[in-house]
Interface confidence: low
């Protein structure tokens, strides 16, 4: 069944953790729907963002961090593995030095850690998507 | 009660018509939620857009038209009468030569007609808002 959007969940992340999201754009790519995933340092939407991942479907992806309330250096990619009108599965894996973002099983983006992933307390998924799955898996110790 | 978003309704517009929308941003302005209202020429989301009105809350408003599938000259305004976290009432009135956009009873934006308003067949309201009212009123002849 559908999950509410914006979708917010408390989360603890460390090397080996993976966040998995399954959803679908709510509009055709011509209309430029967005998907956004934010890893926050607090259970407050105005808190700092360790990893900000925003897709403008059909156009580009931007990644960034928000530190002490200010956006830092934006990283942009024109890689667009998402398909117009199709369901997507997005997984964000915490590697020792970076986040690795897979789209439909294909490694698509990376973002070097600026703040340690252990600082993450909440994940929010929002903007112009319907959401059918959200899961945080932890590496078994 | 809440209306679903994206919200789509068939509509016929002409001089004297007013589209009224009541809603609330789904996120704090720091996170830059959007509101978008599109006046389409067909009951298809990929159809041309006679009037495109997009608010990036707390930052700016852009207005445009999409003709034969291509976006035209964008009009931008930094005027920001919307309040962080507050409900808004937006009304778009069809004047003989332009659209007049009122926010909370205050004239805030105008957009000259590029395509006659009679070409509009559908209105879509979407992006990062909750929606409590949508109404199209017609001037009594």
């Amino acid at each position: 069944s559908l999950l509410p959007v914006p979708y917010t969940e408390a989360a603890s992340l460390s090397t080996g953790s993976t966040v998995t999201i399954k959803g679908r754009p709510l509009a055709c790519f011509l209309n430029e729907p967005y998907l956004q995933v934010d890893f926050h340092t607090e259970m407050k939407e105005e808190s700092d963002i360790v990893f900000h991942f925003q897709v403008c479907f059909g156009r580009r992806v931007v990644m960034n961090s928000r530190e002490y309330g200010a956006w830092k250096q934006q990283v942009e990619s024109k890689n667009m593995p998402f398909q117009d009108g199709q369901e997507f599965e997005l997984s964000i894996s915490v590697l020792p030095d970076k986040y690795q973002v897979m789209v439909n099983g294909q490694s698509s983006y990376t973002f070097d850690h600026r703040i340690k992933p252990e600082a993450v307390k909440m994940v929010q998924v929002w903007r112009d998507i319907s959401l059918t799955k959200f899961n945080v898996s932890y590496l078994k110790r | 009660s809440l209306l679903p978003v994206p919200y789509t309704e068939a509509a016929s517009l002409s001089t004297g018509s007013t589209v009224t929308i009541k809603g609330r941003p789904l996120a704090c302005f720091l996170n830059e939620p959007y509101l978008q209202v599109d006046f389409h020429t067909e009951m298809k989301e990929e159809s041309d857009i006679v009037f495109h009105f997009q608010v990036c809350f707390g930052r700016r408003v852009v207005m445009n038209s999409r003709e034969y599938g291509a976006w035209k000259q964008q009009v931008e305004s930094k005027n920001m009468p919307f309040q962080d976290g507050q409900e808004f009432e937006l009304s778009i009135s069809v004047l003989p030569d332009k659209y007049q956009v009122m926010v909370n009873g205050q004239s805030s934006y105008t957009f000259d007609h590029r395509i006659k308003p009679e070409a509009v067949k559908m209105v879509q309201v979407w992006r990062d808002i909750s929606l409590t009212k949508f109404n199209v009123s017609y001037l009594k002849r």
Epitope: L2, L26, S130 | -
Partner: nanobody
Framework: QVQLVESGGGLVQAGGSLRLSCAAS????????MAWFRQAPGKEREFVAA???????TYADSVKGRFTISRDNAKNTVTLQMNSLKPEDTAAYHC???????????????WGQGTQVTVSS
């Protein structure tokens, strides 16, 4: 998970009426917007009508004034009353459920198998 089963299709003469029903399983029926789409052989799936959770509705221009969509949240059903049928209404009619109120097929996550409507002249 929502499962949808349509019924009420059949063969009817032009000018006649049919009433299509869609029965939904699952306790969350009332939280979904519902719609009817139709698909004629060799053609794209076409929006017919949609209804919000609270009963607001919209129709395709081609059926406006002839078709009426309604829902009964207590019985988990959505109904399409089709009057003044025309040969061009011939198609397989599919019921759909989704989290958004839209005429776009991709906005609906759950679909029925469809019921055939044939209008003869």
């Amino acid at each position: 998970q929502v499962q949808l089963v349509e019924s009420g299709g059949g063969l009817v003469q032009a000018g006649g009426s049919l009433r299509l029903s869609c029965a939904a399983s699952g306790r969350t029926f009332s939280t979904y917007s519902m719609a009817w789409f139709r698909q004629a052989p060799g053609k794209e799936r076409e929006f017919v009508a949609a209804i919000t959770r609270s009963g607001g509705n919209t129709y395709a221009d081609s059926v406006k004034g002839r078709f009426t969509i309604s829902r009964d949240n207590a019985k988990n059903t959505v109904t399409l009353q089709m009057n003044s049928l025309k040969p061009e209404d011939t198609a397989a009619y599919h019921c759909a459920a989704g989290g958004t109120y839209s005429f776009v097929p991709r906005s609906y996550n759950y679909w029925g198998q469809g019921t055939q409507v044939t209008v003869s002249s």
